[in-house]
Protein backbone atom coordinates (compact mmCIF):
# COMPACT_ATOMS: atom_id res chain seq x y z
CA UNK A 1 0.00 0.00 0.00
CA UNK A 2 1.21 3.46 -0.91
CA UNK A 3 2.91 5.39 1.88
CA UNK A 4 2.79 9.19 1.90
CA UNK A 5 6.34 10.54 1.67
CA UNK A 6 8.14 13.59 0.42
CA UNK A 7 9.23 11.48 -2.56
CA UNK A 8 5.88 11.87 -4.32
CA UNK A 9 7.29 13.73 -7.29
CA UNK A 10 5.79 11.99 -10.31
CA UNK A 11 3.07 13.85 -12.19
CA UNK A 12 -0.47 12.99 -11.21
CA UNK A 13 -2.37 10.49 -13.35
CA UNK A 14 -5.60 11.13 -15.20
CA UNK A 15 -8.70 9.26 -14.02
CA UNK A 16 -11.98 8.79 -15.87
CA UNK A 17 -14.96 6.45 -16.02
CA UNK A 18 -16.58 4.69 -18.95
CA UNK A 19 -19.28 4.55 -20.11
CA UNK A 20 -20.25 7.26 -17.62
CA UNK A 21 -19.78 8.59 -14.11
CA UNK A 22 -23.49 7.93 -13.61
CA UNK A 23 -24.08 4.20 -13.33
CA UNK A 24 -27.36 2.37 -12.93
CA UNK A 25 -27.53 0.20 -9.81
CA UNK A 26 -26.22 -3.29 -10.62
CA UNK A 27 -24.48 -2.26 -13.83
CA UNK A 28 -20.74 -2.35 -14.42
CA UNK A 29 -18.36 0.56 -14.87
CA UNK A 30 -14.73 0.88 -15.91
CA UNK A 31 -12.43 3.28 -14.11
CA UNK A 32 -9.37 4.15 -16.17
CA UNK A 33 -6.15 5.50 -14.70
CA UNK A 34 -3.50 6.86 -17.06
CA UNK A 35 -0.02 7.42 -15.67
CA UNK A 36 3.33 6.71 -17.27
CA UNK A 37 4.71 4.11 -19.64
CA UNK A 38 7.19 3.13 -16.94
CA UNK A 39 4.57 2.56 -14.23
CA UNK A 40 4.97 -0.74 -12.40
CA UNK A 41 1.84 -0.48 -10.29
CA UNK A 42 -1.40 1.47 -10.20
CA UNK A 43 -3.51 1.83 -7.07
CA UNK A 44 -7.15 2.87 -6.89
CA UNK A 45 -8.57 4.46 -3.74
CA UNK A 46 -12.23 4.78 -2.82
CA UNK A 47 -13.29 7.37 -0.24
CA UNK A 48 -9.70 7.42 0.97
CA UNK A 49 -9.42 3.65 1.40
CA UNK A 50 -7.33 1.30 -0.73
CA UNK A 51 -9.70 -0.30 -3.25
CA UNK A 52 -7.74 -2.16 -5.92
CA UNK A 53 -4.42 -2.43 -7.67
CA UNK A 54 -3.03 -3.52 -11.01
CA UNK A 55 0.51 -4.33 -12.01
CA UNK A 56 0.76 -3.91 -15.77
CA UNK A 57 2.44 -6.72 -17.66
CA UNK A 58 5.81 -5.49 -18.99
CA UNK A 59 5.07 -6.95 -22.42
CA UNK A 60 2.08 -4.66 -22.86
CA UNK A 61 3.96 -1.40 -22.31
CA UNK A 62 0.79 0.60 -21.72
CA UNK A 63 0.52 3.84 -19.80
CA UNK A 64 -2.98 3.20 -18.48
CA UNK A 65 -4.94 0.50 -16.70
CA UNK A 66 -8.60 -0.32 -16.32
CA UNK A 67 -10.25 -1.10 -13.01
CA UNK A 68 -13.52 -2.93 -13.44
CA UNK A 69 -16.41 -2.56 -11.00
CA UNK A 70 -18.68 -5.43 -11.86
CA UNK A 71 -21.79 -4.28 -10.02
CA UNK A 72 -22.28 -0.67 -9.04
CA UNK A 73 -24.13 -0.21 -5.73
CA UNK A 74 -24.50 2.49 -3.11
CA UNK A 75 -21.44 0.89 -1.47
CA UNK A 76 -19.25 1.63 -4.49
CA UNK A 77 -20.61 5.12 -5.23
CA UNK A 78 -18.42 8.00 -4.12
CA UNK A 79 -15.01 9.54 -4.74
CA UNK A 80 -12.21 7.62 -6.45
CA UNK A 81 -8.59 8.63 -6.90
CA UNK A 82 -5.62 6.78 -8.35
CA UNK A 83 -1.82 6.74 -8.05
CA UNK A 84 0.97 5.01 -9.92
CA UNK A 85 4.47 3.88 -9.01
CA UNK A 86 7.54 4.07 -11.20
CA UNK A 87 10.78 2.80 -9.73
CA UNK A 88 10.83 3.87 -6.09
CA UNK A 89 8.64 6.91 -6.67
CA UNK A 90 4.90 7.34 -6.32
CA UNK A 91 2.86 9.86 -8.22
CA UNK A 92 0.72 12.56 -6.76
CA UNK A 93 -2.97 11.72 -6.47
CA UNK A 94 -5.17 12.07 -9.52
CA UNK A 95 -8.01 14.54 -9.33
CA UNK A 96 -11.08 13.05 -7.67
CA UNK A 97 -13.53 11.09 -9.80
CA UNK A 98 -17.07 11.17 -8.46
CA UNK A 99 -19.14 8.09 -9.30
CA UNK A 100 -22.90 8.27 -8.84
CA UNK A 101 -25.21 5.25 -8.64
CA UNK A 102 -28.70 5.79 -10.01
CA UNK A 103 -31.78 3.61 -10.09
CA UNK A 104 -32.37 3.40 -6.37
CA UNK A 105 -35.75 3.05 -4.68
CA UNK A 106 -38.16 5.29 -6.56
CA UNK A 107 -38.88 7.39 -9.67
CA UNK A 108 -39.59 11.13 -9.44
CA UNK A 109 -42.04 13.11 -11.52
CA UNK A 110 -40.75 16.09 -13.48
CA UNK A 111 -42.87 18.81 -15.03
CA UNK A 112 -42.33 22.33 -16.30
CA UNK A 113 -44.39 25.46 -15.67
CA UNK A 114 -46.06 27.08 -17.49
CA UNK A 115 -45.64 24.50 -20.28
CA UNK A 116 -42.91 22.64 -22.21
CA UNK A 117 -43.13 24.99 -25.22
CA UNK A 118 -42.42 28.60 -24.29
CA UNK A 119 -41.46 31.87 -25.93
CA UNK A 120 -37.97 33.27 -25.77
CA UNK A 121 -37.64 35.32 -22.55
CA UNK A 122 -40.55 33.70 -20.77
CA UNK A 123 -40.08 32.64 -17.13
CA UNK A 124 -39.90 28.89 -16.69
CA UNK A 125 -39.76 26.71 -13.58
CA UNK A 126 -39.12 22.96 -13.39
CA UNK A 127 -40.73 20.96 -10.60
CA UNK A 128 -39.44 17.62 -9.37
CA UNK A 129 -41.43 15.46 -6.98
CA UNK A 130 -40.56 12.17 -5.31
CA UNK A 131 -42.97 10.24 -3.11
CA UNK A 132 -40.26 8.90 -0.84
CA UNK A 133 -38.60 11.57 1.26
CA UNK A 134 -35.14 12.59 0.07
CA UNK A 135 -32.57 15.17 1.04
CA UNK A 136 -31.77 16.77 -2.29
CA UNK A 137 -33.04 16.92 -5.86
CA UNK A 138 -30.89 17.20 -8.99
CA UNK A 139 -31.98 18.58 -12.34
CA UNK A 140 -29.87 17.56 -15.32
CA UNK A 141 -29.93 18.57 -18.94
CA UNK A 142 -28.82 16.10 -21.57
CA UNK A 143 -25.83 16.78 -23.78
CA UNK A 144 -23.34 19.59 -23.72
CA UNK A 145 -21.50 21.16 -20.83
CA UNK A 146 -24.45 21.91 -18.62
CA UNK A 147 -24.76 22.62 -14.94
CA UNK A 148 -26.67 20.37 -12.64
CA UNK A 149 -28.88 22.34 -10.38
CA UNK A 150 -29.74 20.98 -6.98
CA UNK A 151 -32.28 21.94 -4.35
CA UNK A 152 -32.84 20.67 -0.84
CA UNK A 153 -36.37 19.44 -0.25
CA UNK A 154 -38.42 16.72 1.32
CA UNK A 155 -40.68 15.44 -1.43
CA UNK A 156 -40.62 18.28 -3.95
CA UNK A 157 -38.23 20.90 -5.30
CA UNK A 158 -38.63 23.70 -7.77
CA UNK A 159 -35.96 24.93 -10.17
CA UNK A 160 -36.65 28.47 -11.44
CA UNK A 161 -34.85 28.94 -14.74
CA UNK A 162 -35.67 32.65 -15.06
CA UNK A 163 -36.27 34.16 -18.49
CA UNK A 164 -35.31 31.43 -20.93
CA UNK A 165 -32.81 31.75 -23.74
CA UNK A 166 -32.04 29.32 -26.53
CA UNK A 167 -29.38 27.81 -24.28
CA UNK A 168 -32.17 26.45 -22.09
CA UNK A 169 -33.67 24.35 -24.86
CA UNK A 170 -33.16 20.62 -24.51
CA UNK A 171 -34.22 17.55 -22.63
CA UNK A 172 -34.21 17.47 -18.83
CA UNK A 173 -34.52 14.78 -16.18
CA UNK A 174 -34.50 14.97 -12.43
CA UNK A 175 -33.36 12.69 -9.62
CA UNK A 176 -33.91 12.51 -5.91
CA UNK A 177 -30.76 11.75 -3.96
CA UNK A 178 -30.30 9.81 -0.76
CA UNK A 179 -26.78 11.18 -0.53
CA UNK A 180 -24.65 13.03 -3.08
CA UNK A 181 -23.66 9.78 -4.83
CA UNK A 182 -26.82 7.63 -4.46
CA UNK A 183 -29.66 8.78 -6.66
CA UNK A 184 -33.15 7.62 -7.49
CA UNK A 185 -34.29 6.34 -10.86
CA UNK A 186 -34.41 9.17 -13.40
CA UNK A 187 -37.70 10.91 -14.09
CA UNK A 188 -39.27 10.66 -17.50
CA UNK A 189 -37.63 13.22 -19.80
CA UNK A 190 -39.16 16.64 -20.32
CA UNK A 191 -38.10 18.52 -23.45
CA UNK A 192 -38.16 22.29 -23.28
CA UNK A 193 -38.88 23.96 -26.62
CA UNK A 194 -38.15 27.65 -27.23
CA UNK A 195 -40.09 29.60 -29.86
CA UNK A 196 -39.81 33.15 -31.11
CA UNK A 197 -36.82 35.40 -31.58
CA UNK A 198 -34.74 35.69 -34.73
CA UNK A 199 -35.26 32.09 -35.82
CA UNK A 200 -39.02 31.83 -35.45
CA UNK A 201 -39.10 28.09 -35.02
CA UNK A 202 -39.31 25.45 -32.30
CA UNK A 203 -35.83 24.47 -31.27
CA UNK A 204 -35.33 21.01 -29.83
CA UNK A 205 -32.00 19.27 -29.18
CA UNK A 206 -30.29 18.29 -32.39
CA UNK A 207 -29.34 14.89 -31.02
CA UNK A 208 -31.63 13.97 -28.14
CA UNK A 209 -30.91 10.83 -26.18
CA UNK A 210 -32.37 9.28 -23.08
CA UNK A 211 -29.22 7.37 -22.25
CA UNK A 212 -27.34 8.64 -19.21
CA UNK A 213 -24.20 7.16 -20.70
CA UNK A 214 -23.87 10.18 -22.98
CA UNK A 215 -24.45 12.94 -20.47
CA UNK A 216 -21.81 15.43 -19.58
CA UNK A 217 -22.44 17.95 -16.88
CA UNK A 218 -21.13 20.27 -14.23
CA UNK A 219 -21.91 19.85 -10.56
CA UNK A 220 -23.33 22.74 -8.60
CA UNK A 221 -23.56 22.03 -4.90
CA UNK A 222 -24.45 25.34 -3.34
CA UNK A 223 -27.17 25.57 -0.68
CA UNK A 224 -29.75 27.28 -2.88
CA UNK A 225 -29.15 25.21 -5.95
CA UNK A 226 -29.75 28.31 -8.07
CA UNK A 227 -26.27 29.71 -8.43
CA UNK A 228 -23.78 27.76 -10.45
CA UNK A 229 -20.23 27.12 -9.43
CA UNK A 230 -17.28 26.29 -11.59
CA UNK A 231 -16.59 22.76 -10.40
CA UNK A 232 -16.52 20.72 -13.58
CA UNK A 233 -17.57 17.14 -13.10
CA UNK A 234 -17.07 15.29 -16.35
CA UNK A 235 -16.02 11.83 -17.52
CA UNK A 236 -12.35 12.83 -17.37
CA UNK A 237 -10.63 14.67 -14.54
CA UNK A 238 -7.15 15.87 -15.37
CA UNK A 239 -6.46 19.50 -14.42
Amino acid sequence: QRINTEKETLPKPIIWAKPSIMVTNGNSVNIWCQGAQSASEYQLYFEGSFFALERPKPSRSMNKVRFFISQMTSHTAGIYTCFYQSGELWSKSSNPLKLVVTGLYDTPNLWVYPRPEVTLGENVTFFCQLKTATSKFFLLKERGSNHIQNKYGNIQAEFPMGPVTRAHRGTYRCFGSYNDYAWSFPSEPVTLLITGGVENSSLAPTDPTSSLDYWEFDLSTNESGLQKDSAFWDHTTQN
Epitope: N30, F46, S49, F50, F51, A52, L53, E54, R55, P56, K57, V65, R66, F67, F68, I69, S70, Q71, T73, H75, T76
Partner: nanobody
Framework: EVQLVESGGGEVQPGGSLRLSCAAS????????MGWFRQAPGKEREFVAA???????YYAESVKGRFTISRDNAKNTLYLQMSSLRAEDTAVYYC????????????????????WGQGTLVTVKP
Protein backbone atom coordinates in the same frame (compact mmCIF):
# COMPACT_ATOMS: atom_id res chain seq x y z
CA GLU B 1 -25.06 -17.16 -9.81
CA VAL B 2 -21.88 -18.03 -7.95
CA GLN B 3 -21.81 -19.96 -4.69
CA LEU B 4 -18.76 -20.05 -2.46
CA VAL B 5 -18.22 -22.62 0.27
CA GLU B 6 -15.27 -22.37 2.65
CA SER B 7 -13.73 -25.29 4.54
CA GLY B 8 -10.58 -26.14 6.46
CA GLY B 9 -11.11 -24.02 9.54
CA GLY B 10 -10.51 -25.36 13.02
CA GLU B 11 -8.51 -24.99 16.17
CA VAL B 12 -4.74 -24.81 16.04
CA GLN B 13 -1.90 -23.92 18.39
CA PRO B 14 0.22 -20.78 17.99
CA GLY B 15 2.91 -21.41 15.37
CA GLY B 16 0.75 -24.03 13.66
CA SER B 17 -0.58 -24.20 10.12
CA LEU B 18 -3.94 -24.56 8.38
CA ARG B 19 -5.07 -24.58 4.79
CA LEU B 20 -8.43 -23.05 3.97
CA SER B 21 -10.29 -23.96 0.80
CA CYS B 22 -13.07 -22.19 -1.02
CA ALA B 23 -15.04 -24.20 -3.56
CA ALA B 24 -16.85 -22.15 -6.19
CA SER B 25 -19.81 -23.34 -8.21
CA UNK B 26 -20.35 -22.37 -11.81
CA UNK B 27 -18.07 -21.97 -14.80
CA UNK B 28 -17.03 -18.40 -14.07
CA UNK B 29 -14.26 -19.13 -11.56
CA UNK B 30 -11.40 -18.65 -14.05
CA UNK B 31 -12.67 -15.17 -14.90
CA UNK B 32 -13.10 -14.12 -11.27
CA UNK B 33 -10.80 -12.14 -9.03
CA MET B 34 -10.81 -13.71 -5.58
CA GLY B 35 -10.00 -12.66 -2.05
CA TRP B 36 -9.92 -13.72 1.59
CA PHE B 37 -11.24 -11.51 4.38
CA ARG B 38 -11.58 -12.17 8.08
CA GLN B 39 -13.63 -10.91 10.96
CA ALA B 40 -12.55 -11.29 14.56
CA PRO B 41 -15.15 -11.13 17.35
CA GLY B 42 -16.21 -7.54 17.97
CA LYS B 43 -14.15 -6.21 15.06
CA GLU B 44 -14.82 -5.11 11.50
CA ARG B 45 -14.21 -7.37 8.55
CA GLU B 46 -10.66 -6.90 7.24
CA PHE B 47 -8.76 -7.74 4.09
CA VAL B 48 -6.33 -10.69 4.24
CA ALA B 49 -5.20 -11.56 0.71
CA ALA B 50 -6.34 -11.36 -2.89
CA UNK B 51 -5.48 -12.89 -6.23
CA UNK B 52 -6.21 -11.72 -9.75
CA UNK B 53 -7.48 -14.02 -12.46
CA UNK B 54 -3.93 -14.12 -13.81
CA UNK B 55 -2.52 -15.20 -10.41
CA UNK B 56 -1.07 -11.87 -9.32
CA UNK B 57 -1.35 -11.59 -5.52
CA TYR B 58 -1.49 -9.00 -2.77
CA TYR B 59 -1.41 -9.43 1.03
CA ALA B 60 -2.27 -7.42 4.10
CA GLU B 61 0.88 -6.37 5.94
CA SER B 62 -0.16 -8.40 9.00
CA VAL B 63 -0.04 -11.71 7.10
CA LYS B 64 2.70 -11.08 4.55
CA GLY B 65 5.28 -13.86 4.62
CA ARG B 66 3.02 -16.15 6.66
CA PHE B 67 -0.03 -16.66 4.43
CA THR B 68 -0.15 -17.71 0.77
CA ILE B 69 -3.16 -17.33 -1.49
CA SER B 70 -3.48 -19.53 -4.57
CA ARG B 71 -6.09 -20.86 -6.94
CA ASP B 72 -6.75 -23.95 -9.00
CA ASN B 73 -9.00 -23.05 -11.91
CA ALA B 74 -9.36 -26.70 -12.94
CA LYS B 75 -10.86 -27.46 -9.53
CA ASN B 76 -12.73 -24.15 -9.17
CA THR B 77 -11.04 -23.73 -5.81
CA LEU B 78 -9.32 -20.90 -3.95
CA TYR B 79 -6.82 -21.65 -1.16
CA LEU B 80 -5.28 -19.84 1.77
CA GLN B 81 -2.24 -21.54 3.24
CA MET B 82 -1.71 -20.15 6.74
CA SER B 83 1.45 -20.79 8.73
CA SER B 84 3.11 -19.35 11.85
CA LEU B 85 -0.38 -18.71 13.16
CA ARG B 86 -0.86 -16.28 16.03
CA ALA B 87 -3.65 -15.67 18.52
CA GLU B 88 -4.55 -12.49 16.64
CA ASP B 89 -5.32 -14.57 13.52
CA THR B 90 -8.38 -15.99 15.30
CA ALA B 91 -11.39 -15.00 13.20
CA VAL B 92 -14.06 -16.17 10.81
CA TYR B 93 -12.45 -16.31 7.36
CA TYR B 94 -14.53 -15.43 4.31
CA CYS B 95 -13.88 -16.19 0.68
CA UNK B 96 -15.11 -13.56 -1.80
CA UNK B 97 -15.29 -13.18 -5.57
CA UNK B 98 -15.56 -10.41 -8.12
CA UNK B 99 -17.42 -11.82 -11.11
CA UNK B 100 -16.75 -10.89 -13.81
CA UNK B 101 -13.50 -8.98 -13.72
CA UNK B 102 -10.91 -7.70 -16.12
CA UNK B 103 -7.21 -8.12 -16.74
CA UNK B 104 -4.96 -8.23 -13.72
CA UNK B 105 -7.17 -6.38 -11.23
CA UNK B 106 -6.59 -7.24 -7.57
CA UNK B 107 -9.33 -6.05 -5.25
CA UNK B 108 -8.55 -5.02 -1.68
CA UNK B 109 -11.76 -3.30 -0.60
CA UNK B 110 -14.71 -5.45 0.49
CA UNK B 111 -17.15 -3.23 -1.44
CA UNK B 112 -15.64 -4.46 -4.71
CA UNK B 113 -16.68 -8.06 -4.09
CA UNK B 114 -20.12 -9.17 -5.23
CA UNK B 115 -20.13 -12.79 -3.98
CA TRP B 116 -19.32 -14.04 -0.49
CA GLY B 117 -19.12 -17.36 1.28
CA GLN B 118 -20.57 -18.11 4.70
CA GLY B 119 -17.18 -18.23 6.40
CA THR B 120 -15.10 -20.78 8.31
CA LEU B 121 -13.83 -20.27 11.86
CA VAL B 122 -10.13 -20.35 12.65
CA THR B 123 -9.17 -20.42 16.33
CA VAL B 124 -5.56 -20.07 17.43
CA LYS B 125 -5.00 -20.85 21.10
CA PRO B 126 -2.49 -22.77 23.27
Amino acid sequence: EVQLVESGGGEVQPGGSLRLSCAASGRTFASAAMGWFRQAPGKEREFVAAISRSDDTYYAESVKGRFTISRDNAKNTLYLQMSSLRAEDTAVYYCAAVVPTYGNNIYVHSAAYNYWGQGTLVTVKP
